[in-house]
Interface confidence: low
Amino acid sequence: KELKVTQPEKSVSVAAGDSTVLNCTLTSLLPVGPIRWYRGVGPSRLLIYSFAGEYVPRIRNVSDTTKRNNMDFSIRISNVTPADAGIYYCVKFQKGSSEPDTEIQSGGGTEVYVLAKPSPPEVSGPADRGIPDQKVNFTCKSHGFSPRNITLKWFKDGQELHPLETTVNPSGKNVSYNISSTVRVVLNSMDVNSKVICEVAHITLDRSPLRGIANLSNFIRVSPTVKVTQQSPTSMNQVNLTCRAERFYPEDLQLIWLENGNVSRNDTPKNLTKNTDGTYNYTSLFLVNSSAHREDVVFTCQVKHDQQPAITRNHTVLGFAHSSDQGSMQTFPDNNATHNWN
């Protein structure tokens, strides 16, 4: 019977750590000579197994090749690693009397794809916080996967984003691969509760993609709106001033009251009000004894947020000497509001 070496599977896929069988059958045992398994072709091919009875870690013959009529030269590779990926050839040699064995026929080859899971995606963002309307880049990285085909998607609050660039390295064949993707996000003031998600889908993940998450709260700064107002007097001798810092993030806030430019009170906020969008509000009350002030006084509320330059709002209250009518109070509609003591 004419010799034919058959490798029925063009390819097999195996998860890292599992076993795989590479099948090889012959139609004839003649001419006499060994069968060997190689990975790769050409001068640099690697001898994997030769059925010569020697111990090869992780590789066993499937059938008993010592039997005279055995024509099954399949092998089992156990505990497969990404380094085992490649094309395996079952090769028949003719035994030489004095010269080396001569290769007479090879099977068509079986490609082993080692399925290695990608690492959990890591999403990194800018080192410094951005502000609303600023465009910031996020990068997602995952490594160690095989085969090379992989899908990476970006989402912001459930909406898919289009990446600036996605690259899978190396570009040639390799035992495992890495993916890196960059997306650009336009921050807005409602993003404190938002998340940017990098989702990686791969054949090894059984329809359960891996996700890397970046909470935009770690990458955004929303500066407060600061307003100073005067409440209606509670008695003849006192004025209530209120400084309100609204919709800021993160929490880090320092508030100082100044009287004619001199520090009057340091206010370290403790009980912040949290808004539904994740930002905070803070209200500072400043009770001023009017009997101590006959001249105009400029009160300043100075707010320092997250190590940023201070935001100041002035509020002028007219001295007692200006007031002809004990019940009067003038208001000037701007940030430097002016009121009578009363």
Epitope: K135, I150, T151, E160, H162, L164, E165, T167, S181, V186
Partner: antibody
């Protein structure tokens, strides 16, 4: 100057798979920085984006077609291809391939190839 | 998906007229918008990218503006060769979507 040329059968029977190839000339598909897209246009209608591939592997599909579409790239032949399975008469359209830079738009298009789905 | 609403769907203008086409996105897409021209039987041609940048070799009578959800495409002085259908396209969110098109004719 990059040029694109679509090729493939102009007539496909219902339930079969539509296969088109876009050949890139005047530049390398694997030079990076570009997406290679497929777009179609039903007779007398607007444009519909089918999907895009980046030379190094990542592929993006229109969800409305995702279950039937496969886009692949063959860097050795400087080609990318589209396969659309289980076609019906509703897939009759002019199919275009295009090159797109993220911040330079779809600046190169093939001339388009008409595919009719009919028995 | 992001919906791109283009208006008008068709218009007729005289040579030399100023022609304006608007495109509205169903949500904020920043400036991630392109404009294309398509003549009968031909492939689309890129005119404007990133909302306002003129593509290479495109005459300066074409311009684009806008950001967020509202965008405008203008032909400052209509020429006979400008008879075509014009499309906007967003690329902020997948899947990329096109407007329904505006057919421009000469009176």
């Amino acid at each position: 100057q990059v040029q694109l040329q679509e090729s493939g059968p102009g007539l496909v029977k219902p339930s079969q798979t539509l296969s088109l190839t876009c050949t890139v000339s005047g530049g390398s598909i694997s030079s990076g920085g570009y997406y290679w897209s497929w777009i179609r246009q039903h007779p007398g209608k607007g444009l519909e984006w089918i999907g895009a591939i980046y030379y190094s592997g990542p592929i993006y599909y229109n969800p409305s077609l995702k279950s039937r579409v496969t886009i692949s790239v063959d860097t050795s032949k400087n080609q990318f291809s589209l396969k659309l399975s289980s076609v019906t008469a509703a897939d009759t359209a002019v199919y275009y391939c295009s090159k797109e830079g993220y911040h330079s738009g779809m600046d190169v298009w093939g001339q388009g190839t008409t595919v009719t789905v009919s028995s | 998906d992001i919906q791109m609403t283009q208006s008008p769907s068709s218009l007729s203008a005289s040579v030399g007229d100023r022609v304006t086409i608007t495109c509205q996105a169903s949500q904020d897409i920043s400036n991630y918008l392109n404009w294309y021209q398509q003549k009968p039987g031909k492939a689309p041609k890129l005119l404007i990218y990133d909302a306002s940048n003129l593509a290479t070799g495109v005459p300066s009578r074409f311009s684009g503006s806008g950001s967020g959800t509202d965008f405008t495409f203008t032909i400052s002085s209509l020429q006979p060769e400008d008879i075509a259908t014009y499309y906007c396209q967003q690329f902020a969110y997948l899947p990329w979507t096109f407007g329904g098109g505006t057919k421009v004719e000469i009176k």
